[in-house]
């Protein structure tokens, strides 16, 4: 489901996220700030003047500036969230929609090589949709998803860097690779 005017927001599985309301400043005129999770049309948090702040469960926290914190993101937190703000006269002064998408963070990529086959492999084990980039002495060699295999033809002594990234994280590994002329492991 795609909402065209939604703020695209990415969060990492297991981490906290703050849904900040852009261009909103809290003032005395604000009476009501209500957050909804739209898939089940359920109110999840609400601030009302002179009333106790409501939160549907402890994983939600509502700050005085209207920001909603969701703690320890789970896959079912991926949803469309709506915040509605009303003034003391009951007028809807602001409405924002957040399209929260969740990815698992990438793990540190593992670089391994064999001098016999003159082949280097970079692999990332965890993470949603990781993209890998391989560099040799600072020069970009290739990019791929999840696994990169690189074969060389000459004797090799070089520094390889492999970077794994997705929308919520990025991790790198660096390995100095040295192979003798004859190709011994």
């Amino acid at each position: 489901k795609e909402i065209t005017n939604a703020l695209e927001t990415w969060g990492a599985l297991g981490q906290d996220i703050n849904l900040d309301i852009p261009s909103f400043q809290m003032s005395d005129d604000i009476d009501d700030i209500k957050w909804e999770k739209t898939s089940d049309k359920k109110k999840i948090a609400q601030f009302r003047k002179e009333k106790e702040t409501f939160k549907e469960k402890d994983t939600y926290k509502l700050f005085k500036n209207g920001t909603l914190k969701i703690k320890h993101l789970k896959t079912d937190d991926q949803d469309i969230y709506k915040v509605s703000i009303y003034d003391t006269k009951g007028k809807n002064v602001l409405e924002k929609i957040f399209d929260l998408k969740i990815q698992e963070r990438v793990s540190k990529p593992k670089i391994s090589w064999t001098c016999i086959n003159t082949t280097l492999t970079c692999e990332v084990m965890n993470g949603t949709d990781p993209e890998l980039n391989l560099y040799q002495d600072g020069k970009h060699l290739k990019l791929s998803q999840r696994v990169i295999t690189h074969k060389w033809t000459t004797s090799l002594s070089a520094k390889f860097k492999c970077t794994a990234g997705n929308k919520v994280s990025k991790e790198s590994s660096v390995e100095p690779v040295s192979c003798p002329e004859k190709g011994l492991d």
Epitope: L7, E8, D129, N166
Partner: antibody
Framework: QVQLQQPGTELVRPGSSVKLSCKAS????????VNWVKQRPDQGLEWIGR????????HYNQKFTDKAISTIDTSSNTAYMQLSTLTSDASAVYYC?????????????WGQGTLVTVSS | IVMTQSPATLSVTPGDRVSLSCRAS??????LHWYQQKSHESPRLLIK???QSISGIPSRFSGSGSGSDFTLSINSVEPEDVGVYYC?????????FGAGTKLELR
């Protein structure tokens, strides 16, 4: 809702430098690379380089390594590209665009472009 | 990687089915993206990874190919499709674009 806002025009003197800006909104700024692309009048597109707001990692087209420097201000969700020692060849429209870190070579959304005119 | 597009210009009639060609100087697997640029506008992404559709792009646009030969097809051209179409190498750096195919109405 995704927006990449660029100033419309910049008039600069030959030999001087210019710092182009690209203000992002409507998405998680640190989830996407910011790319810079040059387009001379009635000509094709030329990739200058890119920067990752997550950690300020940069990649440049070798042709522009001594000409362009990309920087980031995450507090204002703004990317900058400084072009130095400008000649008439630098007169062009400069676009910023974003590419997702998990499929980072497709330029998914573009700014309106800044027309840079190098003239004395 | 050098990207070569053909033809340079294509004159069409609304309703035509057209094919635009793009060739890479070496194999780039399916790391090929297509853009449309209308007059006085910014480019916009039409197709990514040779054949993957983009949200908001009309279904008449489709892409095919792998390796070094790629095709962008428009199955029934509309007047608003006039513009320049660019293919882009997304396989290795520097990212490179073709010179473009200009689509005009006959």
């Amino acid at each position: 809702q995704v927006q990449l806002q660029q100033p419309g025009t910049e008039l600069v003197r030959p030999g001087s430098s210019v710092k182009l800006s690209c203000k992002a909104s409507g998405y998680t700024f640190t989830s996407y690379w910011v790319n810079w692309v040059k387009q001379r009048p009635d000509q094709g597109l030329e990739w200058i380089g890119r920067i990752d707001p997550y950690d300020s990692e940069t990649h440049y087209n070798q042709k522009f390594t001594d000409k362009a420097i990309s920087t980031i201000d995450t507090s204002s969700n703004t990317a900058y590209m400084q072009l130095s020692t400008l000649t008439s060849d630098a007169s062009a429209v400069y676009y910023c665009s974003r590419s997702p870190r998990d499929s980072s070579t497709n330029l998914a959304d573009w700014g309106q472009g800044t027309l840079v005119t190098v003239s004395s | 990687i050098v990207m070569t597009q053909s033809p340079a210009t294509l004159s069409v009639t609304p309703g035509d089915r057209v094919s635009l060609s793009c060739r890479a100087s070496q194999s780039i697997s399916d790391y090929l993206h297509w853009y449309q640029q209308k007059s006085h506008e910014s480019p916009r992404l039409l197709i990514k990874y040779a054949s993957q559709s983009i949200s908001g792009i009309p279904s008449r646009f489709s892409g095919s190919g792998s390796g070094s030969d790629f095709t962008l097809s428009i199955n029934s051209v509309e007047p608003e499709d006039v513009g320049v179409y660019y293919c882009q190498n997304g396989h290795s750096f520097p990212l490179t674009f073709g010179a473009g195919t200009k689509l005009e109405l006959r």
